[in-house]
Interface confidence: low
């Protein structure tokens, strides 16, 4: 049966916490990803950005979880208007920004 949205969001947050807390070296070898607008459509936008990182096992689970939140199919090279134009940041910073934003959503009860 489907996982309740609150549980799914909490599990995603837990995974992001796990990634940030476990860093011993630059995440994904310091790979850069497009920064996104966190105010709307955050799950699809995040996936569209992170899906372009390959060969980084540390974020594979996050990619799968984000896929469960995004209603449409996302493939590498696909970018929505939610991307912040011409701004790239390290995966580590991207993950942490996403974590902080999702924690806010959870606190405010915005599970979808």
């Amino acid at each position: 049966s489907p996982v309740p949205p609150s549980t799914a969001l909490k599990e995603l947050i837990e995974e992001l916490v796990n990634i940030t807390q476990n860093q011993k070296a630059p995440l994904c070898n310091g790979s850069m990803v497009w920064s996104i607008n966190l105010t709307a459509g955050v799950y699809c936008a995040a996936l569209e950005s992170l899906i372009n990182v390959s060969g980084c096992s540390a974020i594979e689970k996050t990619q799968r979880m984000l896929n469960g939140f995004c209603p449409h199919k996302v493939s590498a090279g696909q970018f929505s208007s939610l991307r912040v134009r011409d701004t790239k940041i390290e995966v580590a910073q991207f993950v942490k920004d996403l974590l902080v934003h999702l924690k806010k959503l959870f606190r405010e009860g915005q599970f979808n």
Partner: antibody
Framework: QMQLVESGGGVVQPGRSLRLSCAAS????????MHWVRQAPGKGLEWVAV????????HYADSVKGRFTITRDNSKNTLNLQMNSLRAEDTAVYYC???????????????WGQGTMVTVSS | SYVLTQPPSVSVAPGQTARITCGGN??????VHWYQQKPGQAPVLVVY???DRPSRIPERFSGSNSGNTATLTISRVEAGDEADYYC???????????FGGGTKLTVL
Amino acid sequence: QMQLVESGGGVVQPGRSLRLSCAASGFAFRTYGMHWVRQAPGKGLEWVAVIWYDGSNTHYADSVKGRFTITRDNSKNTLNLQMNSLRAEDTAVYYCARAPQWYLSAEAFDLWGQGTMVTVSS
Amino acid sequence: SYVLTQPPSVSVAPGQTARITCGGNLIGSKLVHWYQQKPGQAPVLVVYDDSDRPSRIPERFSGSNSGNTATLTISRVEAGDEADYYCQVWDHSSDHVVFGGGTKLTVL
């Protein structure tokens, strides 16, 4: 209003035991991770121990591991710290503090008690 | 175990900006919280999750965190801001909470 009130402090001889309590009110105690933090006179803050919201996990600072035990009673909204084999270096103000609970992560301490003084001296 | 390093003291004139640093290995990957403690009082949370502020804390308090340094910035410093300030993180590798040594802010 939301409140944490510590009790049980006092003067005790080295090697003896003391039990601190922290009474919580005004919030859903059972949903928060709870911590003890201490501060020796004139020194900085030192984390002592944490207990998960449901009591399922505890962690201790190396300086107190094996001597101190943190417990909670969610039915009574109470946090406890059993301190055994006390040493002079355990002399400090002991604060209880709450933190919203995420798996594998301690959140910020958004509510603190006023503290209770423990003096270990012969 | 994880170590957080703060300057013992920072001095600033009223109305100026105070910056208190907190150094730690790859601290930018951790969520940093800041506390203010006045003499004889319990600590008070002033910034959490690097840069968020509890509702009762003035906008003059802000935080940032990247690389190996987190910073608490207090703009338009007032006499009432004089206190000790502590940074704090959770160290996952040891399952311990870690505090910095504290910084005494003096308003000249």
